[in-house]
Interface confidence: low
């Protein structure tokens, strides 16, 4: 993303990660007699279909891999540029997708990449100069490694490790909403929505036609892209004669608020522009499309409202699981709260707390959600996505519970099964009051900080807050250090 990153997070640092939380359930793979294999527990319960035929495939695969057993299985997703070259990135180069097939599985995961947006000629030119990969396919690598929810390793992806994985690079800069080609009038193409449609069409010829479930997922702008496109994907599949494919959404870090900025600023560049201003301008510049049912709720010129999760969600037909940090860095960036490592002022601190409260309020009626009280941005394709817990439940577990709710009757069950929750929103009030939040490191020293250190670093006034809570400062500090 374009925003300045103040806090460095696990996975971006060479030092040892903190003690990891538990890994996924996996049935174990039995090593061959005396074979020094790099084996790990595998979850065969995730294998759909005929077990015998699956085991036969495994046996034949094992035999063919035996000579190179020291090498790792290829985890990469392979690039396919769209055959329909009229569906393009901003610069007119063909859009595309990365695919890793899983022949035994009828689950398909389509992931929409994020990366902000641009909404006028100036900031799109600037984006083209500095972040060309997000506007052109010309320099895309031939392969990508699947991480987090795109990983085929059960320990990294207990949720859907066995699924067919598709990564759709973001090269349209339009929050996946556009449907306008490059022309004499338009220097750039904005075809995000059409790219998704075209990828789905092409995948039908690569096995998607036999899918049981298509999960459209995305992070950041890709998360908002999920909200904007999930119903349209379901409609497309119905039109093309595949009504039995269940389409669901997973929107990560794309549930933004059209709130008032902490400090009002002019809409000069992408990251300082208030959310509503940026989207109002963008939707015109991109010829952006929003879901039809949402569009009908707002008068002409007000379609920008549909880019905001809490407004579009109630209009969606497809089930959507919302993942959102309560203190999202991108939200704070557009709200002009810049955490530069200097202690924050009291006004900022109250603004941040209030943001968490507001966000929590918007998730009240969202059936499936996971919202930890952390200062962060994006999670589902981070390799530490299994680590964070809300009320003792990890995200992969919550997704598993959500999945199960569809099996227990054909309708999405509104009440989660006992012990298998999927509406998980933190209720503690400060950033990182959840002890499983991604580790924070001091930007300058690289040192890990505990919650108490972090909050004090941000100017958190222990005395005042302890007074407000009616407790001893030392007790409050102890609670914070333990993450309570």
């Amino acid at each position: 993303s374009e925003g300045r990153k103040t806090w460095r997070r696990r996975g971006q640092q060479p030092p040892q990660p903190p003690p990891p939380p538990p890994l996924p359930q996996r049935a174990e793979v039995e090593p061959g007699a005396g074979q020094p294999v790099e084996s790990f527990p595998l979850d065969f319960t995730a294998v759909e279909g005929n077990m015998d035929s699956f085991m036969a495939q495994v046996k034949s695969l094992a035999q063919s891999l035996y000579p190179c057993s020291a090498q790792q299985l290829n985890e990469d997703l392979r690039l396919h540029l769209l055959l329909n070259t009229s569906v393009t990135c901003n610069d007119g180069s063909p859009a595309g997708y990365y695919l890793k097939e899983s022949k035994g599985s009828r689950r398909w995961l389509l992931f929409l990449e994020g990366g902000w947006y641009c909404f006028n000629r100036e900031n799109c030119d600037s984006r083209y100069d500095t972040m060309r990969r997000l506007m052109s396919s010309k320099d895309w690598p031939h392969t990508r490694t699947g991480t987090g929810i795109l990983s085929s390793q059960p320990e990294e992806n207990p949720h859907w490790w066995n699924a067919n994985m598709v990564f759709i690079p973001y090269c349209s800069s339009d929050v996946w909403s556009g449907a306008s080609p490059k022309s004499d009038k338009n220097e750039y193409a904005f075809m995000g929505s059409l790219i998704i449609q075209e990828v789905v069409r092409e995948l039908l010829g690569k096995g998607l036609s036999g899918a049981k479930v298509l999960l459209l997922a995305g992070s950041s702008a890709g998360g908002t892209g999920v909200l904007l496109n999930v119903d349209r994907v379901a409609e497309l599949l119905e039109e093309l004669g595949y009504p039995s494919i269940q389409v669901r959404g997973l929107a990560d870090s794309g549930w933004f608020l059209d709130n008032k900025q902490y400090r009002r600023s002019d809409c000069i560049d992408t990251i300082n522009c208030a959310p509503t201003d940026a989207i109002r301008r963008g939707i015109r510049y991109w010829s952006g499309m929003v879901p039809e049912r949402c569009q009908r709720q707002f008068k002409e010129g007000e379609e920008w409202n549909c880019f905001f999760g809490y407004k579009v969600y109630p209009t969606l037909r497809c089930p959507v699981f919302v993942v959102q940090w309560l203190f999202d860095e991108a939200q704070l960036t557009v709200d002009n709260v810049h955490l530069t490592g200097q202690p924050v002022q009291e006004g900022q601190w109250l603004y941040i707390q209030n943001l968490g409260r507001e966000l929590r309020g918007t998730l009240k009626d969202v059936q499936a959600s996971f919202a930890p009280a952390c200062l962060s941005h994006e999670i589902i394709i981070r390799s530490y996505w299994t680590d964070v817990q809300v009320k003792g439940t990890s995200l992969p577990r919550a997704l598993h519970c959500w999945d199960r709710s569809f099996h227990d009757s054909h309708k999405a069950s509104k009440t989660p099964m006992k012990g298998c929750p999927f509406h998980l929103v933190d209720s503690c009030p400060w950033p990182h009051c959840n002890p499983s939040c991604p580790t924070i490191r001091d930007q300058f020293t690289g040192q890990e900080m505990n919650v108490a250190q972090f909050l004090m670093h941000m100017g958190f006034d222990v005395q005042t807050v302890a007074q407000q809570q009616g407790m001893e400062p030392s007790k409050l500090l102890g609670m914070l250090s333990n993450g309570n």
């Epitope: 990660p17 003690p19 890994l23 996924p24 084996s39 320990e155 012990g419």
Partner: antibody, heavy 119, light 111 residues
Framework: EVQLVESGGGLVKPGGSLKLSCAAS????????MHWFRQAPEKGLEWVAY????????YYADTVKGRFTISRDNAKNTLSLQMTSLRSEDTAMYYC????????????WGTGTTVTVSS | DIVLTQSPASLAVSLGQRATISCRAS??????????MHWYQQKPGQPPKLLIY???NLESGVPARFSGSGSGTDFTLNIHPVEEEDAATYYC?????????FGSGTKLEIK
């Protein structure tokens, strides 16, 4: 309360058979892989067998392969271990244990049932 | 199979002091930043009880005087300060592959 209770142990002659059961309660049994372990008198813990949550996968220790069969009935929340061709070295306390769905450790154990193989 | 060598076989520690138990694996049991080593306590006539999972995570309900550390092949369980009720046999267990094996146990006696 999360609980596992074994039953079915007893005295049996070498070459005989016995079926152990493990009744689960207090949790969603069908979510978890289950294991059997044993502990000979004054000895350490030994893994015996594993069954995945949906019964699709089973594994056995080399010492019991071909003689013991692990099974489960998710509708009845029951895990079983059918033991045949018993030998004196199978004498032990047998425990069923729940494998936590994260990470390969055993967070719930039964109280155990004693199997004695002797003529 | 991965062999876990536990030491010492037994130890006697005074009340309030520190008990340290080591476990060495015959092969690396850590991967991708995770260490598949766990610790259990067993008292006579009782089943094992999980204390520490994934090398250093305290199982819910276990007193904070128990702690685990280590990675790769070498792992340690510390108990400090030792209390009367900690007299038991302690086992390490790996889950890096099948079969999951246990150390031979360390018997802790309180002086």
């Amino acid at each position: 309360e999360v609980q596992l209770v074994e039953s079915g142990g007893g005295l049996v002659k070498p070459g005989g058979s016995l079926k152990l059961s493990c009744a689960a309660s207090g949790f969603t049994f069908s979510d978890y892989g289950m294991h059997w372990f044993r502990q000979a008198p004054e000895k350490g813990l030994e893994w015996v067998a594993y069954i995945s949550s949906g019964s699709r996968t089973v594994y056995y220790a080399d010492t019991v392969k071909g003689r013991f069969t692990i099974s489960r009935d998710n509708a009845k929340n029951t895990l079983s271990l059918q033991m045949t061709s018993l030998r004196s070295e199978d004498t032990a306390m047998y425990y069923c244990a729940r494998k936590h769905y994260n990470g390969g450790y055993f967070d719930v154990w039964g109280t155990g049932t004693t199997v004695t193989v002797s003529s | 199979d991965i062999v876990l060598t536990q030491s010492p076989a037994s130890l006697a520690v005074s009340l309030g002091q520190r008990a340290t138990i080591s476990c060495r694996a015959s092969k690396i049991v850590s991967t991708s930043g995770y260490s598949y080593m766990h610790w259990y306590q067993q008292k006579p006539g009782q089943p094992p009880k999980l204390l520490i999972y994934l090398a250093s995570n305290l199982e819910s309900g276990v007193p904070a005087r128990f702690s685990g550390s280590g990675s790769g092949t070498d792992f340690t369980l510390n108990i400090h300060p030792v209390e009367e009720e900690d007299a038991a046999t302690y086992y390490c267990q790996h889950s890096r592959e099948l079969p999951p094996t246990f150390g031979s146990g360390t018997k802790l006696e309180i002086k």
